[in-house]
């Protein structure tokens, strides 16, 4: 079978490179909840982490990334089961000994308090209370985000420098 | 330090769902370069898999899916130096014994030929002429991709049912 | 309706082997981590085994590791339990159980099968 | 291993009274406890995870509390399907998920 990908509908001429932005994403697509300046999607089905990060990047979005408190504590209010987790997107660099968000930002000391091991292949899951880590191979519900980017960004991440 | 996420300058209401799908996508964003029905950004820094996935994924994208031949040869048209390499979105899939699209789709056998052990933690690269696979470990350049979906699909994945 | 149905127990000598096998309905099986557990004649509860949901993980008491090997097959809606090297420690009555979806490793039992009695005696 | 001492083993209560059995973990488990209602030659029931959320269909004179090392299950006013054997389990995400020793609650 091969990857299901979206046909398009009209001639676009090849190999040309374009310096406008991406749209502005004013609602959230079908099916994702908004929260705030994001989009949530909370899956049905139970993945490892790694799967997880895969189905979010296929979806053209993330695995959740948390800025604060306020973010975790609203994200935390649309769980309405105490026992139902979902991966994030952030897990234990082993490298640099230290927790690490998928856009390659570390977790600030102040931010969530991750109860469980800070070893290798640990990954974060937040569940209705807390935010956990348990191994990366786990399955669990996972959630993805796509950013509400009313804002336009011109600036390159380094990597693409 | 907190993960960089982009803040809405107007007052969205929260917890709404909403039930529009994402904006056309009819151009591609600074950077990107337009290739048919998709949008491809060639990473200049190198990475293992994973990594290189996270980093699509947090630009709302996927690691390069390539439907068929025909894509394969364009794609490869792009690399200009024989001796770089690029991951791309397939690995190994231990407990299935086949080699996986990130989107859940497996290889068919008459698309690429894969050059390269098919066996646990191998991912798979494409170079100007070929492709291979290899350690996941292995740290090299990548490529992401958006697609430029102009007809709207309202299908849910199962994922999400 | 939703259920779990074991089978394969019986009577089996000392050093013998027996499969038990544990039909699912009415509920997604392949998404959920799968446990077998059981209880002796007149004592208390002993988990035994997990799988998870795509049996890539799996996890034994130390009492049965290496004798026993946990299995599923999703397409069948099936887990098994392959039991060798039986003890007469071994006699209980094995039920499956199916986790709470989306609990990760913290298994918490909600469904649970009527249970199949495996003797070892010689 | 994480250990589970329940008490009491055995009670004998009348129909109406409130009943406590309480669950002691070795080391802390945080709020990873369950508590199961077992009647003779039937499978056991979960009647709440998490230590203190109720499962779906179970009457709400079951309450579960505690956190840490120390857990209670209560029945706030028992009624005559509940003599049975009640269970402990704690699952903490490394196995042995462990079980108490159980808590026969008898006619009175």
């Known amino acids: 079978q091969k990857p299901s990908i979206g046909k398009c509908s009209v001639d676009i001429q090849q190999n040309r490179t374009k310096t406008t932005e991406r749209p502005d994403l004013l609602n959230c697509p079908i099916y994702w909840q908004q929260v705030q300046e994001k989009c949530l999607l909370f899956s049905h089905t139970v993945n490892p982490w790694n799967n997880s990060l895969a189905d979010c990047s296929t979806k053209e979005s993330s695995l959740l990334l948390i800025q604060d408190k306020d973010e975790l504590t609203r994200t935390q209010n649309l769980i309405h089961d105490k026992a139902i987790s979902f991966w994030i997107g952030l897990n234990f660099s082993l490298s640099e000994k230290n927790w690490k968000w998928i856009n390659g930002s570390f977790l600030s000391s102040n931010d969530l308090k991750i109860t469980g091991d800070a070893k290798e292949n640990s990954c974060v899951y937040i569940s209705q209370t807390s935010v956990y880590s348990e191994y990366c191979s786990t399955e669990m519900k996972w959630i993805c985000q796509k950013e509400l980017t009313l804002v336009r960004n011109k600036v390159s991440p380094d990597s693409w420098l | 330090q907190k993960p960089s996420i982009g803040k809405c300058s107007v007052d969205i209401q929260q917890n709404r769902t909403k039930t529009t799908e994402r904006p056309d996508l009819l151009n591609c964003p600074i950077y990107w370069q337009q290739v048919q029905e998709k949008c491809l950004l060639f990473s200049h820094t190198v990475n293992p898999w994973n990594n290189s996935l996270a980093d699509c994924s947090t630009k709302e994208s996927s690691l390069l899916l390539i439907q068929d031949k025909d894509e394969l040869t364009r794609t490869q048209n792009l690399i200009h130096d024989k001796a770089i390499s690029f991951w791309i979105g397939l690995n190994f899939s231990l407990s299935e014994k086949n080699w996986k699209w990130i989107n859940g789709s497996f290889l068919s056998s008459n698309d690429l030929k894969i050059t390269g052990d098919a066996k646990e933690n191998s991912c798979v690269y494409i170079s100007q002429t070929s492709v291979y696979s290899e350690y996941c470990s292995t740290e090299m350049k990548w490529i992401c991709q958006k697609e430029l979906t102009l007809v709207r699909n309202k299908v849910s994945p199962d994922s999400w049912l | 309706q939703v259920q779990l149905v074991e089978s394969g127990g019986g009577l089996v000598k000392p050093g013998g082997s027996l499969r038990l096998s544990c039909a699912a309905s009415?509920?997604?099986?392949?998404?959920?981590?799968m446990s077998w557990i059981r209880q002796a004649p007149g004592k208390g509860l002993e988990w035994v085994s997990y799988?998870?949901?795509?049996?890539?993980?799996?996890a034994y008491a130390d009492s049965v590791k290496g004798r026993f090997t946990i299995s599923r097959d999703n397409a069948k809606n099936s887990l098994y339990l392959q039991m060798n090297s039986l003890r007469a420690e071994d006699t209980a009555v094995y039920y499956c159980?199916?986790?709470?979806?989306?609990?990760?490793?913290?298994?918490?039992?909600?469904?649970w099968g009527r249970g199949t009695l495996v003797t070892v005696s010689s | 291993d994480i250990q589970l001492t329940q008490s009491p083993s055995s009670v004998s209560a009348s129909v109406g009274d409130r009943v406590t059995i309480t669950c002691r973990a070795s080391?802390?488990?945080?709020?990873?406890l369950a508590w199961y209602q077992q009647k003779p030659g039937k499978a056991p029931k979960l009647l709440i995870y998490?230590?203190?959320s109720l499962q779906s269909g179970v009457p709400s004179r079951f309450s579960g509390s505690g956190s840490g090392t120390d857990f209670t299950l209560t029945i706030s006013s028992l009624q005559p399907e509940d003599f049975a054997t009640y269970y402990c389990?704690?699952?903490?995400?490394?196995?042995?998920?462990?079980f108490g020793g159980g808590t026969k609650v008898e006619i009175k």
């Open positions: 009415g509920f997604t099986f392949g998404q959920y981590y």
């Open positions: 159980a199916r986790s709470l979806m989306s609990t990760g490793t913290h298994l918490y039992f909600d469904l």
């Open positions: 389990q704690q699952v903490t995400s490394f196995p042995p998920y462990t």
């Open positions: 080391q802390g488990i945080s709020d990873w």
């Open positions: 799988i998870s949901p795509s049996g890539a993980t799996i």
């Open positions: 998490a230590a203190s």
